[in-house]
Amino acid sequence: MLSHAGPARFALFLLCCMETLLPSHMAPTHRLQPSDVRKIILELRPMSKGLLQDYVSKEIGLPESNHSSLPCLSSDSQLPHINGSAILPYFRAIRPLSDKNTIDKIIEQLDKLKFQREPEAEVSMPADNFERKNFILAVLQQFSACLEHVLQSLNSGPQ
């Protein structure tokens, strides 16, 4: 069970875009080409932005989350990939408290980026109302930032 207090909140997001740093036994079932990854990210991007904008407009006054804990781009020379396994549990957890249909589409796309044999962590919602809203906001903000980072990297890398 993942704790949502302090720095541990984004423990799984540390793996967001670091496929190239992971051991070979965690390699994706089907290694996607950069063009495939770009296509998935371009599908995820408007959904992620829409969810974030919608949530921010509903939850006025929530503080901006700190993005610094999300090292999306690996320093490896290979192109980074989003680790769907790391992010999926978060979206599964927030689905009942968010736009069901958009989250379903995000889950479908993230599933394509899932890692083979990687155990999925269990993510539970914080009980405190303010903490929970912050948690959802942070997930959406961090995910949007992650997508932007990877897209930037893919666009500047070899086609």
């Epitope: 999926l88 979206f91 599964r92 957890a93 689905r95 009942p96 408290l97 069901k100 989250i103 379903d104 889950i107 479908e108 599933d111 999925e120 539970s124 919602m125 109302n129 929970r132």
Partner: antibody
Framework: QVLLVQSGAEVKKPGASVKIFCKAS????????INWLRQAPEQGLEWMGW????????KYNETFKGRLTLTADTSTNTVYMELSSLRSADTAMYYC??????????????WGQGALVTVSS | EIQMTQSPSSLSASPGDRVTITCRAS??????????MHWYQQKPGQPPKLLIY???NLESGVPSRFSGSGSGTDFTLTISSLEPEDAATYYC?????????FGQGT
């Protein structure tokens, strides 16, 4: 698109068991609960239980405890519902329906077409 | 278990009418700041179809004449302007606590 396809109608004798399936397609099967419900002729809906295919976890309505078994086969994206010790009151349309993705139960947004089970001597 | 009581049990109305169905839960179905109350439509010989989820969210593909409101224990499904194809049985359902329970239908 999301589809839940159920097996066909069954006629059973009292005391027998019935096993019906629900084959899912069009979504990531392991991340969503599958609920089972039934509806007796001209009656309302009764929830029987759910299974989470990702880990095989189940929750049964106390009404069916000991008689109901839900299983999932992730290789074929199929969920099975087995009801034993059938009695005439079990005559109903049995539905599978997709639920939520977390421990917080959610709405059932896609339903199978239903499987009619008739219990008669 | 949470008991769900729908009213009326049946109603007759004409095309263009505004129709309201209410559902009362025996205890609050609110959690995490959200009402886990859902509405379904069922036509003869068909499975139920989700109309409204979490009290007020319109399911994708459902006409905007359907709306839901309420929180805690009291909820309402409204059809703003009735169409002939809306003839059906409507069920409310709570998912806040197992066992999941339904209203008796309208």
């Amino acid at each position: 698109q999301v589809l839940l396809v159920q097996s066909g109608a069954e006629v059973k004798k009292p005391g027998a068991s019935v096993k019906i399936f629900c084959k899912a397609s069009g979504y990531s099967f392991t991340y969503y609960d599958i609920n089972w419900l039934r509806q007796a002729p001209e009656q309302g809906l009764e929830w029987m239980g759910w299974i989470f295919p990702g880990d095989g976890g189940t929750k049964y309505n106390e009404t069916f405890k000991g008689r109901l078994t839900l299983t999932a086969d992730t290789s074929t994206n199929t969920v099975y519902m087995e009801l034993s010790s059938l009695r005439s009151a079990d005559t109903a349309m049995y539905y599978c329906a997709r639920g939520g993705t977390s421990v917080i139960r959610d709405a059932m947004d896609y339903w199978g077409q239903g499987a009619l089970v008739t219990v008669s001597s | 278990e949470i008991q769900m009581t729908q009213s009326p049990s049946s109603l007759s109305a004409s095309p263009g009418d505004r129709v309201t169905i209410t559902c009362r839960a025996s205890e609050s179905v609110d959690n995490y700041g959200i009402s886990f109350m859902h509405w379904y439509q069922q036509k003869p010989g068909q499975p139920p179809k989700l109309l409204i989820y979490r009290a007020s969210n319109l399911e994708s593909g459902v006409p905007s004449r359907f709306s839901g409101s309420g929180s805690g224990t009291d909820f309402t499904l409204t059809i703003s302007s009735l169409e002939p194809e809306d003839a059906a049985t409507y069920y409310c359902q709570q998912s806040n606590k197992d066992p999941l329970t339904f209203g008796q239908g309208t």
